[in-house]
Amino acid sequence: VLEVYYTHLRCRCVQESSVFIPRRFIDRIQISPRGNGCPRKEIIVWKKNKSVVCVDPQAEWIQRIMEMLRKKSSSTPPVPVFKRKIP
């Protein structure tokens, strides 16, 4: 699931990891675009073991997942701009 929130007023990630996580262990991905008090894009990954990690947006593997989710979302009807949720 991919979620994009436009409501955060500060950065949430203190530390970012680029270490690969297989998609089957990912429960949810949240993207916070830069702005609203945070100068950088943040990607937060909820894992199936209930732990949460901030992922470096430049990591190749997360970019591959994002691209796949973008392709998937292009074939689904749009939802309100403040939050996009893609199964």
Partner: antibody, heavy 121, light 106 residues
Framework: EVQLVESGGGLVQPGGSLKLSCVVS????????MAWVRQTPTKGLEWVAS????????YYRDSVKGRFTVSRNNAKSSLFLQMDSLRSEDTATYYC??????????????WGQGASVIVSS | DIQMTQSPSFLSASVGDRVTISCKAS??????LTWYQQKLGKAPKRLIY???ILQTGIPSRFSGSGSNTDYTLTISSLQPEDFATYFC????????FGAGTKLELK
């Protein structure tokens, strides 16, 4: 040559404990996620647990959560499965296997020969 | 949890036959499907991963196809060494194996 060798299987009473080990050679162990998979004639193949490169991230099937613990020792190229509060339904052949490497590549898929675990009184 | 329904459970065929084995997922698994062959007393051996990528060293008579929820393993011309049990595995969300297809000599 890639090799995964399991040990530690055996007969144990319900409620008892057992620790399986898997020693690997022929590849850089710390580069790979690893998993335990079990097999029975009735239930077939079942994923049991997975662990990431440094052991900091672990995942379990629901039926073993809180009873089984997967761990690894990268210095000794070894994978472990500590099994506590064993039940008769845990009786199976347990295999260790490789998963993705650090880059997400899934080119290698190596399995051990299996360790037999029998839970019976 | 994703369920995998594999069919048939048993399949009788002759050397030279073309055979297909199917796996149906309970939801879209985005082509994250693997096929294994297992012989008695041995560990499973991967044949195909990501739906259609042939594992190095596996003969080209094995092929995989499918998308969304429906996947197929095809053996174009059965050889004597192909009589074994075949399993599918979804890796889209955790892991689920199919129940297996036992391929027997007719």
């Amino acid at each position: 040559e890639v090799q995964l060798v399991e040990s530690g299987g055996g007969l144990v009473q319900p409620g008892g404990s057992l620790k399986l080990s898997c020693v690997v050679s022929g590849f850089t162990f710390s580069d790979y996620y690893m998993a335990w998979v079990r097999q029975t004639p009735t239930k077939g193949l079942e994923w049991v647990a997975s662990i990431n490169y440094d052991g900091g991230d672990t995942y379990y099937r629901d039926s073993v959560k809180g009873r089984f613990t997967v761990s690894r020792n990268n210095a000794k190229s070894s994978l472990f499965l500590q099994m506590d509060s064993l039940r008769s339904e845990d009786t199976a052949t347990y295999y260790c296997k490789t998963e993705e490497d650090y880059d997400g590549s899934y080119v290698m898929d190596a399995w051990g020969q299996g360790a037999s675990v029998i839970v019976s009184s | 949890d994703i369920q995998m329904t594999q069919s048939p459970s048993f399949l009788s065929a002759s050397v030279g036959d073309r055979v297909t084995i199917s796996c149906k997922a309970s939801q879209n698994i985005n082509k994250e499907l693997t096929w294994y062959q297992q012989k008695l007393g041995k560990a499973p051996k991967r044949l195909i991963y990501n739906t259609n990528i042939l594992q190095t060293g596996i003969p080209s008579r094995f092929s995989g196809s499918g998308s969304n929820t429906d996947y197929t393993l095809t053996i174009s011309s059965l050889q004597p060494e192909d009589f074994a049990t075949y399993f599918c595995l979804q890796q889209s969300s955790l892991y689920t194996f199919g129940a297996g297809t036992k391929l027997e000599l007719k």
